[in-house]
C-alpha cells in the first residue's frame, strides 16, 4: 500500500490519497500549519510535509515527476518525487530537472538552440520506445504554448492541453501526444480504477467536458466489473 511504502522511507502521517484522475471525485482535505521547509519551495512545511500521490507527471510540481518511490515498486503506488539533476539516470524527460532532458538514459542539459529539433526528433523516434515519452516536457522548457503561434487543431502534436485549440485536450496517442476532442455527453470515457493506470494507455481519451463527469452507464450496473461502460454524464 501507499502508506507502507512511505513508512519504509520514514515519511510520516500520509493521509488518504487526494483527488483522482479525470472524472474521479476529489477527496476532502484540510490545511496543516508548520514551519518552513528549508531548501524547498517557500510554502512547504517540514514537520508535516506529506508526499503528494499522483498518477502522472503533470500533477506534480515543476521540479518533480510521478513515480513509485521504491525501485521496481507497484506501479499503482506513485508519489511526486524530486527531479533528477544533470548526469543522473533517467527513463523519460519529466524525470530530469528544468533545463535538462533525458537522452540515452542520462539527464543532459537542454541547448535551447537545437532544442526544438531534439523534441521533434524524439517524437519521431519515440514510436515504440516507451522511455522517450513527452510527458512532463511542457513544464521543463521554453517549448510551451507560447512557441505555437496558433493553437493546435485536432491531430496536432502537443505537449499539454493549453497547446490545443478550445474543445481539445492533449492526450497520448501511441508514444507521443496529440490534440483530441474533449468528450461530450454520452461519449465513452475512461474511469481509472487505480492510480497510475492511465500511464499504461497507448490511446488516451480526453476528459469529459465542462459540467460532465465520467460515470458508469446506468444500464451497465449489472455487468461485471471489468466490462462496465463509463460515459460522460451531467453532474
Amino acid at each position: 500500500t501507499l502508506n507502507s511504502v512511505l513508512n519504509s522511507n520514514a515519511i510520516k502521517n500520509l493521509p488518504p490519497p487526494l483527488g483522482g484522475a479525470a472524472g474521479h471525485p476529489g477527496s476532502a482535505v484540510s490545511a496543516a500549519p508548520g514551519i518552513l521547509y528549508p531548501g524547498g519551495n517557500k510554502y512547504q512545511t517540514i514537520d508535516n510535509y506529506q508526499p503528494y500521490p499522483c498518477a502522472e507527471d503533470e500533477e506534480c510540481g515543476t521540479d518533480e515527476y510521478c513515480a513509485s518511490p521504491t525501485r521496481g515498486g507497484d506501479a499503482g503506488v506513485q508519489i511526486c518525487l524530486a527531479c533528477r539533476k544533470r548526469r543522473k539516470r533517467c527513463m523519460r524527460h519529466a524525470m530530469c530537472c528544468p533545463g535538462n532532458y533525458c537522452k540515452n538514459g542520462i539527464c543532459v542539459s537542454s541547448d535551447q538552440n537545437h532544442f526544438r529539433g531534439e523534441i521533434e526528433e524524439t517524437i519521431t523516434e519515440s514510436f515504440g520506445n516507451d522511455h522517450s515519452t513527452l510527458d512532463g516536457y511542457s513544464r521543463r522548457t521554453t517549448l510551451s504554448s507560447k512557441m505555437y503561434h496558433t493553437k493546435g487543431q485536432e491531430g496536432s502534436v502537443c505537449l499539454r492541453s493549453s497547446d490545443c485549440a478550445s474543445g481539445l485536450c492533449c492526450a497520448r496517442h501511441f508514444w507521443s501526444k496529440i490534440c483530441k476532442p474533449v468528450l461530450k455527453e454520452g461519449q465513452v470515457c475512461t474511469k481509472h480504477r487505480r492510480k497510475g493506470s492511465h500511464g499504461l494507455e497507448i490511446f488516451q481519451r480526453c476528459y469529459c467536458g465542462e459540467g460532465l463527469s465520467c460515470r458508469i452507464q446506468k444500464d451497465h450496473h449489472q455487468a461485471s466489473n471489468s466490462s462496465r461502460l463509463h460515459t460522460c454524464q451531467r453532474h
Epitope: L14, P15, L18, G19, G20, A21, A22, H24, P25, G26, V29, S30, A31, A32, G34, Y37, G40, N41, Y43, Q44, T45, N48, Y49, Q50, P51, Y52, P53, A55, E56, E58, E59, C60, G61, T62, D63, E64, C80, A82, R139, S145, R160, S161, S162, C169, Y207
Partner: nanobody, 129 residues
Framework: EVQLVESGGGSVQAGGSLRLSCTAS????????MAWFRQAPGKEREFVAA????????HYADSVKGRFTISRDNAKNTAFMQMSSLKPEDTAVYYC??????????????????????WGQGTQVTVSS
C-alpha cells in the same frame, strides 16, 4: 494587470443551488491551480475547493464534499463551482484564487491560502432557512 472576477453569487433558499464563475484575465492561468475560499462574518477565511493545473485533480473541504463541484475551462481562463444542497452555514463571501504550480508539491498545497498569488474581490452567497 491580472484580475480575477467572480460572478454567480446571490440569495437562495436552503436546499437550493448556485453556480459561481471566476474569470481570469491578464495572463494565461493554465499552469495555476484555481480555488474557492469563503469567509463568513466574524470567521476566518476557509478553503472550500480547488482544481489543479492538470485538470485531473480536485480537492474539497469536508464540509462541502458531495455537494459542491469545482471545474475549469482553460481555453476560457474560467473556473466554476457548482453549489447544490446549500445550507445556511454556507452563507459567506466566496473568493476565487489562483496559485502557481510550485516547484515541490505536498498534500497541503491546495488548501493553504498563502500559496495563492491572485485573489478576486469576492461574491456574496446567502442561504436562508
Amino acid at each position: 494587470e491580472v484580475q480575477l472576477v467572480e460572478s454567480g453569487g446571490g440569495s437562495v433558499q436552503a436546499g437550493g443551488s448556485l453556480r459561481l464563475s471566476c474569470t481570469a484575465s491578464g495572463r494565461p492561468f493554465d499552469n495555476y491551480a484555481m480555488a474557492w475560499f469563503r469567509q463568513a462574518p466574524g470567521k476566518e477565511r476557509e478553503f472550500v475547493a480547488a482544481i489543479s493545473w492538470s485538470l485531473s485533480r480536485t480537492h474539497y473541504a469536508d464540509s462541502v464534499k458531495g455537494r459542491f463541484t469545482i471545474s475549469r475551462d482553460n481555453a476560457k481562463n474560467t473556473a466554476f463551482m457548482q453549489m447544490s444542497s446549500l445550507k445556511p452555514e454556507d452563507t459567506a463571501v466566496y473568493y476565487c484564487a489562483a496559485a502557481p504550480r510550485p516547484k515541490r508539491i505536498s498534500v497541503q498545497y491546495f488548501t493553504t491560502s498563502s500559496n495563492y498569488d491572485y485573489w478576486g474581490q469576492g461574491t456574496q452567497v446567502t442561504v436562508s432557512s
